[in-house]
């Protein structure tokens, strides 16, 4: 920290200039007062100083605003956003969307940092649920954001947020996270005839419960094998060769290089034999002829 | 994307020197550069300064009269020219750029070494 000392007769600052990056750290503490640098905070960007200088500014700030900046102030902070600490934007009340743009383009071409997730966090919660125009910022910025969130926050995404979601945003995502995105999907997309509402249900499908492949499975919609392989285990199983034949289209010949990996080779194995043979694509592994199947789990429902 | 520094040497004192500083990965346009030093167990402080168009330029007291700052866009570099060379001029001169088209990058280079000694 800067001790405090007089500032020296004539150098006291009129505007925030070029002119600063040629005072020592102690003159800046003495001679810039706190409120002119918040209403010239946008100058600062233009200005080359150095990473010590702009301590001494935060620091400037810091004391005129102890409970946290306006938001007049954060959406001029350019390159000091990245002297911000969490615990610094945990005070901060930032509602306006060109606010959030302004400090992440800031950060734009690094890894999301802890203050960028703060900020972020902050953000959402001020506006009480992830809306089209923020998702579609966030996205643009970090396209595996949606994916960093978990289920209970994937939660509060209204269903027309999701016309924001590219097929990116969604490669780092688990089936927990898919399972609540999933209906969400659905239901913004329900009023779109067949092929285009596959074609923006698709990157969703590792979310989709049997009934809803078996409804697929009926409209022709030739899923390619990268699709299949991340739907759920548990929803490919009860699915019929009949089913999968007409849901893979012509892509159904890429079952025989898949069937050692799930969910491919747990299908297999629920299939009987003659079933599979009439793929003519030699998977082996299905109930052998004259088998007798008991599903122990509808027995249970049922006693 | 950086800055990379150049020119930097031993002189004599009332010697010249000229220091580059080029831009890599980006243009340098649309950033004002400043020219700063840092002697050994000081402060880094400002030296010079220039505005993206060229047009406005600054120098700290020390070095007024003496060092002259110039820009070449085509070139994608900036220039600072030493002469009358000081003993207490001697430190390590690193460039910084600010500003930028969406007016919120900085690069910062290495810096090279100068010394003035007899």
């Known amino acids: 920290e800067v001790e405090k000392t007089a500032c020296p007769s004539g150098k006291k600052a009129r505007e925030i200039d070029e002119s600063l990056i040629f005072y020592k750290k102690w003159e800046l503490e003495a001679c810039v007062d706190a409120a002119l640098l918040a209403t010239q905070m946008d100058r600062v960007n233009a200005i080359p100083f150095t990473y010590e200088q702009l301590d001494v500014l935060k620091h400037k700030l810091d004391e005129l605003y102890p409970q946290g900046y306006p938001e007049s102030v954060i959406q001029h902070l350019g390159y000091l956003f990245l002297k911000m600490s969490p615990e610094d934007i945990r005070k901060w009340n930032v509602t306006s969307l060109e606010t959030l743009k302004a400090l992440l383009e800031v950060n734009k071409g690094h890894e999301m940092s802890p203050q960028v997730a703060t900020l972020i966090d902050r953000f959402v919660k001020g506006r009480g649920q992830l809306d089209k125009d923020t998702l579609d910022t966030l996205t643009a910025f970090y396209p595996g954001y949606l994916c960093s969130l978990s289920p209970e926050e994937l939660s509060s995404v209204p269903p027309s947020s999701i016309w924001a979601v590219r097929p990116q945003d969604l490669d780092t995502c688990d089936p927990r996270q898919l399972d609540v995105l999933y209906p969400k999907a659905r239901l913004a997309f329900q009023n779109m005839n067949g092929s285009e509402y596959f074609v923006k249900i698709q990157s969703f499908l590792g979310g989709a419960p049997t009934e809803d492949l078996k409804a697929l499975s009926q409209q022709n919609v030739s899923m390619d094998l990268a699709t299949f392989m991340k739907l759920r285990t548990d929803a490919v199983l009860p699915l019929t060769v009949a089913e999968v034949q007409k849901l893979l289209g012509p892509h159904v010949e890429g079952l025989k290089a898949e069937e050692r990996h799930r969910p491919v080779r747990d299908w297999i194995l629920r299939q009987r034999q003659d079933d599979l043979d009439t793929l003519g694509l030699g998977l082996q592994g299905g109930i052998p002829n004259g088998y007798l199947v008991l599903d122990l789990s509808m027995q249970e429902a049922l006693s | 994307l950086q800055l990379v520094e150049s020119g930097g040497g031993l002189v004599q004192p009332g010697g010249s020197l000229r220091l580059s500083c080029a831009a890599s990965g980006f243009t340098l346009d649309y950033y004002a550069i400043g020219w700063f030093r840092q002697a050994p167990g000081k402060e880094r402080e400002g030296v010079s300064y220039?505005?993206?168009?060229?047009?406005?330029?600054n120098y700290a007291d020390s070095v007024k009269g003496r060092f002259t700052i110039s820009r070449d866009n085509a070139k994608n570099t900036v220039y600072l020219q030493m002469n009358s060379l000081k003993p207490e001029d001697t430190g390590v001169y690193s460039c910084?750029?600010?500003?930028?088209?969406?007016?919120?990058?900085?690069?910062w280079g290495q810096g090279t070494s100068v010394a003035v000694s007899s």
């Open positions: 220039i505005s993206s168009s060229g047009g406005s330029t």
């Open positions: 910084a750029a600010a500003g930028g088209y969406g007016n919120s990058s900085r690069y």
